[in-house]
Interface confidence: low
């Protein structure tokens, strides 16, 4: 038997979740804008056709999408983290980030939350995104389990302006494929993820168009095995 056959046999026998899949959203979104946030997030006040909602719907339909675990949304976790009074902290001497488990001299950020949504305003949003992405979840009972460093430290790109404002660029949302045992599973999973991403791209750009800001973005999926199976999707047309 080939090593590939053996690999599939072991997968079949021992694995209960598939490879990670990353849905990458290219830069261009203004995440500090509430309407834009509602196109991405997955909790109350978010759009029913938001990115998070569609990824959740995809996870509920694994036979077609091959998604076994819905991607977590850094944006929703950031909202939750910012609403907890003692999770965001700073050093008063230079206003730099302070871990949530530190006491004096660190102080609570006191993030101002606005509207029914209870989200940070635009300035506060950009001010504290880097703090969230540096904060390590605390499991000792403080309630600050939503710190974003572990889950999203690599998932959110941002550029700093004026030392205090972070403009979020490209981001990714990591989920997991279902268990993939055969070649058919692998290229079907690639196809399914591309269809989900195409729907996300179309929805986001349609909604952005209504904002009249001229931005277009792209959502594409990535998993380690895609490069080996891309040719399967075009094999028949290519041979004709």
């Amino acid at each position: 038997d080939s090593f590939q056959t053996k690999y599939f046999q072991y997968l079949n026998r021992y694995l209960n979740i598939g490879p990670p899949v990353y849905f990458v959203v290219t830069e261009g979104l203004n995440y500090s804008d509430m309407d834009t946030q509602n196109m991405i997030c997955g909790t109350r006040f978010c759009r029913p056709d938001s990115l998070s909602m569609q990824l959740y719907a995809a996870y509920r339909n694994p036979n077609e999408t091959y998604i076994a675990q819905p991607p977590n949304s850094w944006l929703d976790d950031y909202f939750d983290w910012s609403a907890l009074p003692n999770c965001c902290k700073y050093f008063p001497s230079n206003s730099s980030f302070c871990p949530n488990d530190r006491g004096a001299p660190c102080k609570a950020c006191g993030i101002a939350l606005e509207g029914d949504e209870q989200r940070p305003n635009s300035t506060e949003f950009e001010r504290y995104v880097p703090f969230f992405l540096q904060d390590i979840p605390d499991t000792s009972g403080s309630g600050c389990v939503k710190g974003g460093h572990a889950a999203y430290g690599q998932a959110v790109n941002y550029k700093m302006f004026n030392k205090t404002q972070a403009h979020v660029g490209a981001t990714y949302y990591q989920g997991y494929h279902t268990v993939l045992k055969t070649s058919l599973d692998y290229y079907s999973a690639l196809k399914g993820a591309r269809e989900v991403a195409a729907n996300l791209t179309e929805t986001l750009n349609r909604n952005l168009k209504h904002q009249l800001n001229g931005t277009t973005i792209n959502v594409f999926p990535y998993s380690v095995f895609y490069v080996f199976y891309e040719q399967y999707l075009t094999m028949w047309p290519d041979t004709l």
Epitope: F45, C46, R47, P48, D49, M53, A57
Partner: nanobody, 123 residues
Framework: QVQLQESGGGLVQPGGSLRLSCAAS????????IGWFRQAPGKERSFVAA????????YYADSLKGRFTIARDNAKSMVFLRMNNLEPEDTAVYYC????????????????WGQGTQVTVSS
């Protein structure tokens, strides 16, 4: 058994108004989000509006430009869709549907549907 019954459709001139009603029976309306969908001749069914179980959140299709309003009266087990400034493009069969997840109405069709009521906008 969950039942939804739409009423209030009919023929109306462009610029006119209608109020559609959806009567629910066989279940507790308070537990369900309700949405309105429509299907024009030769087109796919599309989302119009939704309201969550306690009426605190509503959501509308972008194309409606604020002309439609969804409301509910849980005490009477009724949901309403007020349609103002109607256009010929609004001609369709209007369906009311119920589901427990308000947030996914536009991506995942809810499980319970009425029979529909015809709305025709024509001069």
């Amino acid at each position: 058994q969950v039942q939804l019954q739409e009423s209030g459709g009919g023929l109306v001139q462009p610029g006119g108004s209608l109020r559609l009603s959806c009567a629910a029976s066989g279940f507790t309306l308070d537990d369900y989000a309700i949405g309105w969908f429509r299907q024009a001749p030769g087109k796919e069914r599309s989302f119009v509006a939704a309201i969550d179980s306690n009426g605190s959140n509503t959501y509308y299709a972008d194309s409606l430009k604020g002309r439609f309003t969804i409301a509910r009266d849980n005490a009477k087990s009724m949901v309403f869709l007020r349609m103002n400034n109607l256009e010929p493009e609004d001609t369709a069969v209007y369906y009311c549907a119920a589901g427990q997840n308000f947030w996914t109405f536009t991506t995942t069709p809810p499980p319970y549907w009425g029979q529909g009521t015809q709305v025709t906008v024509s001069s």
